[in-house]
Interface confidence: medium
Amino acid sequence: APPRLICDSRVLERYLLEAKEAENITTGCAEHCSLNENITVPDTKVNFYAWKRMEVGQQAVEVWQGLALLSEAVLRGQALLVNSSQPWEPLQLHVDKAVSGLRSLTTLLRALGAQKEAISPPDAASAAPLRTITADTFRKLFRVYSNFLRGKLKLYTGEACRTGDR
């Protein structure tokens, strides 16, 4: 992927809108939308003010760990859906899109240098462990996906892209 493709706001917005569509389609859906187990996902809460003052390398650690856990969670959701007796087609479509979207975002972040940033900060070893929550429905899973993209990921890419411009 081109190194700074994710710095084009339209790219992230595309994934954000996909995530929100998925969230919207599962609103009020009970019958087909239970995960039937608790899946661990990243806690998307962001202390905006603390985040803003964080070193970009520390931000990269949080984003990289969160993205990895979220990708695992969505893949687990996809597996559960495949194994269910009658997967709901619109849900299947959005889960598949989320899997594909997270793979693409991982590639785009790697191209931006997030992985290197996440390894190199001097205080990376002492970083607080990633906070997690659980999701028991696809609605919650998609809500976390949507929140993660427009929370930590958007804040991180905004800062990393600005830093790269200097």
């Epitope: 954000l16 809108l17 929140n147 930590k152 804040l155």
Partner: antibody, heavy 127, light 107 residues
Framework: QVQLQQSGPGLVKPSQTLSLTCAIS??????????WNWIRQSPSRGLEWLGV?????????DYAVSVKSRITINPDTSKNQFSLQLNSVTPEDTAVYYC?????????????????WGRGTLVTVSS | SYVLTQPPSVSVAPGKTARITCSGD??????VEWYQQKPGQAPVLVIY???DRPSGIPERFSGSNSGNTATLTISRVEAGDEADYYC??????????FGGGTKLTVL
């Protein structure tokens, strides 16, 4: 229950400095989990966020682009309050001025939601 | 700078559903808040994070946000809901942006 009590003059002459204070009860101005804002409202400009201060091991502030060159927001820890100073005012700055508290730490939106407001102070800029 | 656009007024009969819209470029990718303001009073937060209600706000108030439009929905409207409603979003690093406000009239 957080309460915000505003004080300051209701009339300021053009080119002078507008000064308002917001006294906090039920929370601390130097809390690590809150942020303290000034917002104004006028018929011509509607609601307009002016700036924020917050304490995270040290003091930080952010100001709206529209007033950045003229605004200062300061904490007063001894009195548990914070103040607004707006320099070189013009009649355009005539508005109801509110102080408000926002709480960082929710999903990335709640931190900007202004959950507690002062009652507002009408400030008229006129000679 | 970012602009949020609201209709100046919305009218609704008591017991019916009122919908107030707020539009902005790709607004669905930002979080939206809604404030209720009655004459002579400070605004009151009724919705944050697009659709979450602070404690004390009735369930009749709900919100959604997708594409370019956020919507505040008030079901079973009561006379006491008559007020000005403002949407707001933190659409950039430092500036919180408010919409121009919508006057809700209960017929």
């Amino acid at each position: 229950q957080v309460q915000l009590q505003q004080s300051g003059p209701g009339l300021v002459k053009p080119s002078q400095t507008l000064s308002l204070t917001c006294a906090i009860s039920g929370d601390s101005v130097s809390s690590n989990t809150a942020a303290w804002n000034w917002i104004r409202q006028s018929p011509s400009r509607g609601l307009e966020w002016l700036g924020v201060i917050y304490y995270r091991s040290k003091w930080y502030n952010d100001y709206a682009v529209s007033v950045k060159s003229r605004i200062t927001i300061n904490p007063d820890t001894s009195k548990n309050q914070f103040s607004l100073q707006l320099n070189s005012v013009t009649p355009e700055d005539t508005a109801v001025y509110y102080c408000a508290r926002s709480v960082p730490g929710g999903d990335p939106g709640l931190e900007h939601a202004f959950a507690y407001w002062g009652r507002g102070t009408l400030v008229t800029v006129s000679s | 700078s970012y602009v949020l656009t609201q209709p100046p007024s919305v009218s609704v009969a008591p017991g019916k559903t009122a919908r107030i819209t707020c539009s902005g470029d790709n607004l669905g990718t930002y979080y939206v808040e809604w404030y209720q303001q009655k004459p002579g009073q400070a605004p009151v937060l009724v919705i944050y994070d697009d659709s979450d209600r602070p404690s004390g706000i009735p369930e009749r108030f709900s919100g959604s946000n997708s594409g370019n439009t956020a919507t505040l929905t008030i079901s079973r409207v009561e006379a006491g809901d008559e007020a000005d409603y403002y949407c707001a979003s933190f659409a950039s690093w430092s500036d919180s942006v408010f919409g121009g406000g919508t006057k809700l009239t209960v017929l």
